[in-house]
Every structure is written in structure tokens, then in C-alpha cells.
Amino acid sequence: KESCDVQLYIKRQSYHSIFAGDPFKLECPVKYCAHRPQVTWCKLNGTTCVKLEGRHTSWKQEKNLSFFILHFEPVLPSDNGSYRCSANFLSAIIESHSTTLYVTDVKSASERPSKDEMASRPWLLYS
């Protein structure tokens, strides 16, 4: 029998390489059974995760999974950092792994690097 616990499917030590000025959707895949939990996003500041208030968020439903989406419209250089989603379920808080946004400020780049070039940046690969 499948568990009816809420599960948040963000991979540990995952990351996204994105560009300032672009729109971006950060998805938190949520599995639940009967009642959709309340889900929030926060941004890590050291060891504290600061809840993101007043941000554009939305839900997307797929057949076995729902996605709680944090919208960046557009991405700003200050959006660089690690994010976590959490679900409030039966008075318990379930936290996802954090996922990191690496923001490239296109103003400081002479031209947009390709995804392969992004992937070769040593502070992404080796940190």
C-alpha cells in the first residue's frame, strides 16, 4: 500500500543555471493523497530559511503530481541562492531538499554562454 504522507520531490544538491532578465519557474513537485497541503517557498540565508512573502506563486496539476511554482518575472541577480519548499500537513512541516539558482548577470557577460559553457564553470561543477 502506497504511503499517504506528503512527499516533496526536489533532488538533493540540485541546481539551475539561469540568466538575469529571463523569466524562470522554480517547481516544487508535491505528492499527496486526499487534501492538497499548504506549501510555501523560502530562501536560505545561512542556516535560516526566510519565507518568501508576496511573491507570484501558482499550482500546476499533472496526473500523479502537483507542482507548486515560484515565478521569477524576471530573474534578478539577487535571486542567486538556495531555495526550499515546505508543506504543512497534519500540523507537521515537511521540508524539501534545497535547490540552488546560479544566476548569470548578462550585463557582465559579453555574450550569453551556452549550457555546456555554463556547466563548465568551476564554481558550479566543483563547489
Epitope: R12, Q13, Y15
Partner: antibody
Framework: QVQLQESGPGLVKPSGTLSLTCAAS????????MYWVRQPPGKGLEWIGR????????RYNPSFKSRATISADKSKNQASLKLSSVTAADTAVYYC????????????WGQGTLVTVSS | DIVMTQSPDSLAVSLGERATINCKSS???????????LNWLQQKPGQSPKRLIY???KLDSGVPDRFSGSGSGTDFTLTISSVQAEDLAVYYC?????????FGQGTKLEIK
Amino acid sequence: QVQLQESGPGLVKPSGTLSLTCAASGVNIKDTYMYWVRQPPGKGLEWIGRIDPANGYTRYNPSFKSRATISADKSKNQASLKLSSVTAADTAVYYCAVYDGYYESFDVWGQGTLVTVSS
Amino acid sequence: DIVMTQSPDSLAVSLGERATINCKSSQSLLDSDGKTYLNWLQQKPGQSPKRLIYLVSKLDSGVPDRFSGSGSGTDFTLTISSVQAEDLAVYYCWQGTLFPRTFGQGTKLEIK
């Protein structure tokens, strides 16, 4: 259950490129991380790097500098390793492995393939 | 890089006896999520490695309960409470906290 099968040439010439493929069954690789480890004959294990097949993002061991390239094909449920500019020191058994990216609930290694670098 | 150092390099144990393998990391393996990503692998002769233990002390499914893991921070131990003939293998610790992932040099378990 989760299974992995590595394939590729067992002999590569010095300065050439080693190319290996790892086919997964019993799991959708987009829910995993896939990684490569090598073991020179009679020696210990060395981590080469890993890929998130969901988005193609990679992490590498800096000791491989820019020689290693890991890629994944979600439609074929497989990952690949390319190692360029090989020398005799790259002779090893190469293992691919896969683990649950969310909860670490499984970690499975392939059977390994011996690659010899020699002219 | 985190350096993983195992001790001893090899040990010979009689059937039914306890075997203890130590693993020390050059820095703490406690991650920011409060978990410690320390794994133990078993590699039997001529075979590929198999994960025995993850998150310091969690046993993989199908692993006999004579195997146990313990420790925290930088010091970890794999214990086999009653060694069996099929436990003849090389055992590796490895860390999954920081990149690049790193392995101990291995400990060869022999049967007396």
C-alpha cells in the same frame, strides 16, 4: 529491481577518447542521479562525476580537469561517459551507478567494464 | 577535497567473531540539512561494489543485520557482529556530503 549495464570498447589508444554507455532498467533515470567511478587494477575507487538526467546538469571531479564529459538520454534511459586524451594511467574498471536523488533510498552499481589504454 | 582514511588496511577475523572498521574524514560530513552522508560499500572478489549502509547507520534492503554503522562528524565505524565466510571482501567508506565525492582507501577483510 534497478539494474545497470555498461557497454563500450575495452581497448582505447593513448591520446584517444574513452566512450562508455550505461543503460538503466527498473527505474526512470529522471528521478535519479547517475554517476561514474573508476578502479585501476588492484587499487581503490575514484569518483569521476555525476549527472542529473532530468536537466543534464553535471558535477565533475576536478582531478579530471576538462577531460570528462557525462551526458544522459532520458528517452533511452541511459547515461554516457567520455574521457578524452587518455593515457595508460586511465586503464581501469569503469563503473556507472545510479541512486535515488530524493531520499537516497537506493544506490546500485553496474557490473563494471575494464578499459585498457594501450597502442 | 575531503580525505577519507580507513583503518586498518586489512584485518583477519575468525568466523563468528566481531570485525570493526574505522573511517575518519578530514572535515565534518554533517550537511546543512542536518544529515550525515557517509556510506559503506562492500566489494567481494571479482564483483562490483554494493552499498551496505547509508546515512551513517541505515542498512540497505537485504543487508544482514549483523552489519551496523555508527559515528558522527568525522569519525565513523562499520561493525560486523559475527563474521561469516561470505563477508570476505574489501569495505570502503565514502562521503556524499561535498563535491567531489571521495572514498576511503579500502579495508580488506580476511577470514582466519
